[in-house]
């Protein structure tokens, strides 16, 4: 039950995180005009990864896309790449984790396969979250650097080449969305990896063995709790019976930790 909950929660947290990464990537407010020096401006500038916008006090907003690739700073390109990689990995991770969910039955998929898929999706979520956090952090660092730089020899708007007195920009809402979303995706990924450990089979080479003792029918499973009174608790996954008993088909199977009798 705990494994299912951990896996399910990990999936939901990652889903929210990836939705946040997508939202942050699409948002226009990665950097917003710093109003400290001019709080009475009637024109407000803000920029995203894909376009820059100007909102006039009168309510009109005009956005212009960066229609150049070569004219854009390498750092901006790197941030775009990191965010896209994060989204792609996250999306694949979500797809894999859907099939890995313990509560969803797909054919006769074994727990070992589900465990592997859970681990794969968990790693994908972790990398996705790290990509988003890295992307947002690189952009934030770029803003901090530009903020303190002299106003000359700087891009006006991310894609422009005109050297004018530069409007100073500070952190926009998208950065905070990105950081939180990346963190959630990372946490979700860790939870999936933890859930994978619970899903993974115990390394034992026998199945449940049952025998009769003084009229009591007692069935044991490795790793399980005692099935009837009269024996000490066996919660440490010790072997209960080391005889050569095998089940009818003599095929090895790996029972789940929580398949109690």
């Amino acid at each position: 039950m705990a494994v299912t909950a951990c896996q399910g929660l990990g999936f939901v947290v990652s889903l929210i995180g990836i939705a946040g990464i997508i939202a942050a990537t699409c948002m226009d407010q990665w950097s917003t005009q710093d109003l400290y020096n001019n709080p009475v401006t009637a024109v407000f500038n803000y920029q995203g990864l894909w376009r820059s916008c100007v909102r006039e006090s009168s309510g009109f907003t005009e956005c212009r896309g960066y229609f150049t690739l070569l004219g854009l700073p390498a750092m901006l390109q790197a941030v775009r790449a990191l965010m896209i990689v994060g989204i792609v990995l996250g999306a694949i991770g979500l797809l894999v984790s859907i099939f890995a969910l313990k509560c969803i039955r797909i054919g006769s998929m074994e727990d070992s396969a589900k465990a592997n898929m859970t681990l794969t999706s968990g790693i994908m979520f972790i990398v996705s979250g790290l990509c988003a956090i890295a992307g947002v952090s690189v952009f934030a660092n770029m803003l901090v650097t530009n903020f303190w730089m002299s106003t000359a020899n700087m891009y006006t708007g991310m894609g422009g080449m005109v050297q004018t007195v530069q409007t100073r920009y500070t952190f926009g809402a998208a950065l905070f969305v990105g950081w939180v979303a990346g963190g959630l995706t990372l946490i979700g990924g860790v939870m999936m990896c933890i859930a994978c450990r619970g899903l993974a089979p115990e390394e034992t080479n026998y199945k449940a063995v049952s025998y009769h003792a003084s009229g009591h029918s007692v069935a044991y499973k490795p790793g399980g709790f005692k099935a009837s009174t009269g024996f000490g608790s066996n919660t440490k996954n010790k072997k209960i019976y080391d005889g050569g008993a095998r089940t009818e088909d003599e095929v090895q199977s790996y029972p789940s930790k929580h398949d109690y009798v």
């Epitope: 005009q33 001019n38 009475v40 401006t41 009637a42 024109v43 500038n45 803000y46 920029q47 820059s52 916008c53 100007v54 006039e56 006090s57 009168s58 309510g59 009109f60 005009e62 212009r64 006006t156 708007g157 422009g160 005109v162 004018t164 007195v165 530069q166 409007t167």
Partner: antibody
Framework: QVQLKESGPGLVAPSQSLSITCTVS????????VSWVRQPPGKGLEWLGV???????NYHSTLISRLRISKDKSKSQVFLKLNSLQTDDTATYYC???????????WGQGTSVTVSS | DIVLTQSPSSLTVTAGEKVTMSCKSS????????????LTWYQQKPGQPPKLLIY???TRESGVPDRFTGSGSGTDFTLTISSVQAEDLAVYYC?????????FGAGTKLELK
Amino acid sequence: QVQLKESGPGLVAPSQSLSITCTVSGFSLTTYGVSWVRQPPGKGLEWLGVIWGDGSTNYHSTLISRLRISKDKSKSQVFLKLNSLQTDDTATYYCAKAGRGNALDYWGQGTSVTVSS
Amino acid sequence: DIVLTQSPSSLTVTAGEKVTMSCKSSQSLLNSGNQKNYLTWYQQKPGQPPKLLIYWASTRESGVPDRFTGSGSGTDFTLTISSVQAEDLAVYYCQNDYSFPLTFGAGTKLELK
């Protein structure tokens, strides 16, 4: 079409308050801003203040202590209240709609206000 | 506050003549975000409210004759009337629409000879 019409008292005594109403039609006060501008007789234009679509206001620094601009969206009316009037507040008061570039694209005909005892 | 200085204060012209008037700002009105200058030109005829002619320093308002042209950037702006008509006799004001308060220039009065 867009229209703005000011209505004021005409004559106000010194130290009293001036209240002017600007009734608008053809546009929404929740979307567009409305500015107030005055023009003393034979002189130039003076921007007083503005109320934006979101309800925020900006005032001229010299009038900030005695000027208040508000609106009633349901009645499509914008209000100007100027306190502690002096004789140099005598002017024609205009309300105007803010458009692209923050420019005032539609103006009312103005209302003449004389401050005199 | 941004101060706008208009020159000349008055102009006497003959019909058909080309006219230019200047507006200088104490601070740059160029917004780096969209490379637009937030300067507006108005025309005010006697006994009438002002009428919007040009915004963003050079964008003509719809319905304004194309003989009116706005130009300039940063702090120096010019309004040009390519061929003055009798109906153009008015006072022309420039306005800062970039920073509050949205100040006006003192105006340039256009008169006929």
